[in-house]
Interface confidence: medium
């Protein structure tokens, strides 16, 4: 039986707001909206929390019974949805312990676990993984992309008891490996020799000057003489003009600078490759994985464009719980909204070509009405009447 | 002169789809726009939608998105609005309009039909 | 509701002058010169009055003006008669999205 932490799909309207907690940390962070957005696959089972307001700071937290992950699997999902073609601004969780004071969370607050999508121009699209280790923030040293589309995306960390991790993303892996390889929690555990140093009479050089090589006599040559068929033009004044001198061109036997050749260097013994030790500062930790205490799921973001939309948080110990999950929401609802953003994106090239077909017709009817000013009045007749009249266009 | 003739008046049952008709003379029928507006009895004018005879092309107001279909046939210069899944709401009259008329800007109706009332009843 | 506010009726006396607001936002009347009046009269169709704010159509008697401030347009009618007894309908159309809204309409009575 999967032990469900937490679990938020906001599907009981308006009674978001007696679970979360928005911060007083600061007065002017950003509200957060409950919707399903200008798109989606199910109006009411796509409703999640929206940022609101440009340019703000959002910090908003929601607590749950406290639990360690010690000895078990630690899963953290939810789905992100960045509709507003995000242009700068953070999609991530903070999982904090439960002596956090939710009232006062803010950005500088200490929490366990802070993932998800980050995105700032074209430079920074990127998933956060930090841990807190020991006081300290540590980030993943691998680059995880993120997506940055308008569609809704399910981001999952897998943290397991042997120290593996996993990061999906649309329940496809991204990336996974060691806690220990993929950050820098430990000292290594192999440092260079400090009493090892590179032997004086060790050659590195894989090429030398070849000693019998010598430059040919007739090398040195200038590199621009003058112009052989150039001749002095028949006006030329000397008093006037000088003395005439011919212009200069390239040598074509200029050679440019002599260089031996280069031949294998007999003592070459390669590059000299540090010798490592065991790092006596070195000692395993097992328990990397393990916090005592989770509590509170957070989301404390800066967002230049607001419209970012947040569902579908899963806190387990269950993996295959998290992606069955996944699959049953974000999974139902994907084709829908890609469906439903495709027929709006269609409504509005139809627009943008009508509004362009509107302004035309505005033009030529303007200029039908200057001609009708310009021109003198006329009875309005049809072509076949004017005709047998004998009426004939000016 | 200018003239916008509808179809007459329509009886339809709920779940019905009622298709009305808009005859255009005394303009290039390709010329302009024909829109549809509603009025419901009691109630104010609201825009249905467009369609230019050029091409075909529609747009749809968004509370008729989805079960109003706007066509026109230019080898009849006649314009078309059908209305599916009817409901008793639906019951109103419908009008054509176009700024085919001398003087005003294509963002103006100044020609209307006459009128089609269509009434949605079991 | 209609996207577009006008006050349920107004009245006059022959002779007396009326004006008709229609407040909407700076994404229709506000933000755009496309604001139309049309008259219409019980059982016909209705018949545009004023187009692109203050233009009149030929044929429109010119006691019909149209005037704009912010995002309310005005319909006034001066020297009221009989026959403008009728329900008035201003209208915008929304280039950013091209569509057409209507106000809800008011119902002019002449007195007397």
């Known amino acids: 039986e999967p032990a469900v932490y937490f679990k938020e799909q906001f599907l009981d309207g308006d009674g978001w707001t007696s679970r979360w907690i928005e911060s007083k940390h600061k007065s002017d962070f950003g509200k957060f909206v409950l919707s399903s957005g200008k798109f989606y696959g199910d109006e009411e089972k796509d409703k999640g929390l929206q940022t609101s307001q440009d340019a703000r700071f959002y910090a908003l937290s929601a607590s749950f019974e406290p639990f360690s992950n010690k000895g078990q699997t630690l899963v953290v999902q939810f789905t992100v949805k960045h509709e507003q073609n995000i242009d700068c601004g953070g999609g991530y969780v903070k999982l904090f312990p439960n002596s956090l004071d939710q009232t006062d969370m803010h950005g500088d607050s200490e929490y366990n676990i802070m993932f998800g999508p980050d995105i700032c121009g074209p430079g920074t699209k990127k998933v956060h993984v930090i841990f807190n280790y020991k006081g300290k923030n540590v980030l993943i040293n691998k680059d995880i992309r993120c997506k940055d589309d308008e569609f809704t995306h399910l981001y999952t960390l897998i943290v397991r008891p042997d120290n593996t991790y996993e990061v999906k993303i649309d329940n496809s892996q991204v990336e996974s490996g060691s806690l220990e390889d993929d950050w820098d929690f430990l000292p290594p555990k192999k440092i260079k020799d400090p009493d090892a140093s590179k032997p004086e009479d060790w050659d590195e050089r894989a090429k030398i000057d070849d000693p019998t090589d010598s430059k040919p006599e007739d090398w040195d040559k200038p590199e621009h003489i003058p112009d052989p068929d150039a001749k002095k033009p028949e006006d030329w004044d000397e008093e006037m003009d000088g003395e005439w001198e011919p212009p200069v061109i390239q040598n074509p036997e200029y050679k440019g600078e002599w260089k031996p050749r280069q031949i294998d260097n007999p003592d070459y013994k390669g590059t000299w490759i540090h010798p490592e030790i065991d790092n006596p500062e070195y000692s395993p930790d097992p328990s990397i994985y393990a916090y005592d205490n989770f509590g509170v799921l957070g989301l404390d973001l800066w967002q230049v464009k607001s419209g970012t939309i947040f569902d579908n948080f899963l806190i387990t110990n269950d993996e295959a719980y998290a992606e069955e999950f996944g699959n049953e929401t974000w999974g139902v609802t994907k084709a829908a909204e890609k469906q439903m953003k495709d027929k709006q994106d269609e409504e509005q090239r139809t627009r943008r070509m009508m509004r362009t077909k509107m302004r035309m017709r505005r033009m030529r009817r303007t200029r039908r009405k200057m001609r009708r000013k310009m021109s003198p009045a006329r009875p309005r007749t049809s072509c076949r009447e004017a005709c047998l009249q004998g009426w004939t266009e000016a | 002169q200018v003239q916008l003739v509808q179809s007459g008046a329509e009886v339809k049952k709920p779940g019905a789809t009622v298709k009305i008709s808009c005859k255009v003379s005394?303009?290039?029928?390709?010329?302009?726009?024909i829109h549809w507006v509603q009025q419901a009895p009691g109630k104010g004018l609201a825009w249905v939608g467009l369609?230019?005879?050029?091409?075909?092309?529609?747009i749809y107001a968004e509370k008729f998105q989805g079960r109003v279909t706007i066509t026109a046939d230019t080898s009849t210069d006649t314009a078309y609005m059908e209305l599916s899944s009817l409901r008793s709401e639906d019951t109103a009259v419908y009008y054509c309009a176009t700024p085919g008329g001398i003087l005003t800007d294509p963002d103006a109706f100044d020609i209307w039909g006459q009128g089609t009332m269509v009434t949605v009843s079991s | 509701q209609s996207a577009l506010t006008q006050p349920a009726s107004v009245s006059g006396s022959p002779g007396q002058s009326v004006t008709i607001s229609c407040t909407g936002t700076?994404?229709?009347?506000?933000?755009?010169?496309?604001v139309s009046w049309y008259q219409h009269h019980p059982g016909k169709a209705p018949k545009l009055m004023i187009y692109d704010v203050n233009k009149r159509p030929s044929g429109v008697p010119d006691r019909f003006s149209g005037s704009k401030s912010g995002n309310t347009a005005s319909l006034t009618i001066s020297g009221l008669q009989a026959e403008d007894e009728a329900d008035y309908y201003c209208?915008?159309?929304?280039?950013?999205?091209?569509?057409?809204?209507f106000g809800g309409g008011t119902k002019l009575t002449v007195l007397g």
């Open positions: 209208s915008s159309y929304i280039p950013s999205s091209t569509r057409w809204v």
């Open positions: 369609v230019d005879p050029e091409d075909g092309e529609t």
């Open positions: 005394g303009y290039s029928f390709t010329d302009y726009f």
């Open positions: 700076s994404s229709d009347v506000g933000g755009y010169n496309y």
